[in-house]
């Protein structure tokens, strides 16, 4: 296994909606067929999983259908979405890449996107 | 709040093994940089291995080099030591440490730990 760089914003704000995006850019020492990108969530000394997908260079990334997660690949970086957030879930949220294949096995993790989520304040009553 | 568990120590004769094992209750160790410290009677408390949070990292203390062993195993929630070619002088109290560093060091060992188990003692005599 070899180490490889990963870039990432070190702050988001996620919009009134809940949503949050950010790029992960990984320093690719080869040509990589098969990309797997993680996204963790390290809050309260636990790192827990957010969401997960494999994809094949020039295809689109695939992840779970109930997954909260969104993203497009091109090259080397990948445009992540992550949506349905509320303030409980503000936290520091990694981006790990591995290259698959072909060999050798590449493991990159970024420094962390730091996303703060503010839930919106509800909306006055109207007095007409 | 996670807590860890060491087990798997006792009484050996020299040259003989053992496998410890610490486990994390009310948590996971993903991640984690986990540390094995031993403490014989007498002296300094002194950490013999650790593995860092990706687990592609591990430091041994030279006393220990090509006899011990630390893995991970995150299915399991455990890392262990396997320790062979045992002597009289690994004698102790063996205490696995953990921390939770910032993702930037998870390819590096912790310089100091958070948490600590209750220990397990090893005993290695004839």
């Known amino acids: 296994c070899k180490a490889m760089h990963v870039a990432q914003p070190a702050v988001v704000l996620a919009s009134s909606r809940g949503i949050a995006s950010f790029v992960c850019e990984y320093a690719s020492p080869g040509k990589a067929t098969e990309v797997r990108v993680t996204v963790l969530r390290q809050a309260d000394s636990q790192v827990t999983e957010v969401c997960a997908a494999t994809y094949m260079m020039g295809n689109e990334l695939t992840f779970l259908d109930d997954s909260i997660c969104t993203g497009t690949s091109s090259g080397n970086q990948v445009n992540l979405t992550i949506q349905g957030l509320r303030a409980m879930d503000t936290g520091l949220y990694i981006c790990k890449v591995e290259l698959m294949y072909p060999p050798p096995y590449y493991l990159g993790i970024g420094n962390g996107t730091q996303i703060y989520v503010i839930d919106p304040e509800p909306c006055p009553d109207s007095d007409f | 709040e996670v807590q860890l568990v060491e087990s798997g120590g006792g009484l050996v004769q020299p040259g003989g093994s053992l496998r410890l094992s610490c486990a994390a209750s009310?948590?996971?160790?993903?991640?984690?940089?986990i540390g094995w410290f031993r403490q014989a009677p007498g002296k300094e408390r002194e950490e013999v291995s650790c593995?860092?949070?990706?687990?592609?990292?591990?430091n041994y203390a030279d006393s220990v080099k090509g006899r011990f062993t630390i893995s991970r195993d995150n299915s399991k929630n455990t890392v262990y030591l396997q320790m062979n070619s045992l002597r009289a002088e690994d004698t102790g109290v063996y205490y696995c440490?953990?921390?939770?560093?910032?993702?930037?060091?998870?390819?590096?060992?912790?310089?100091?730990?958070?948490?600590w188990g209750q220990g397990t003692q090893v005993t290695v005599s004839s």
């Open positions: 440490t953990g921390k939770l560093l910032h993702p930037s060091l998870w390819s590096a060992c912790a310089n100091e730990y958070d948490l």
């Open positions: 009310g948590g996971t160790l993903d991640y984690w940089s």
């Open positions: 593995i860092s949070g990706t687990g592609l990292r591990t």
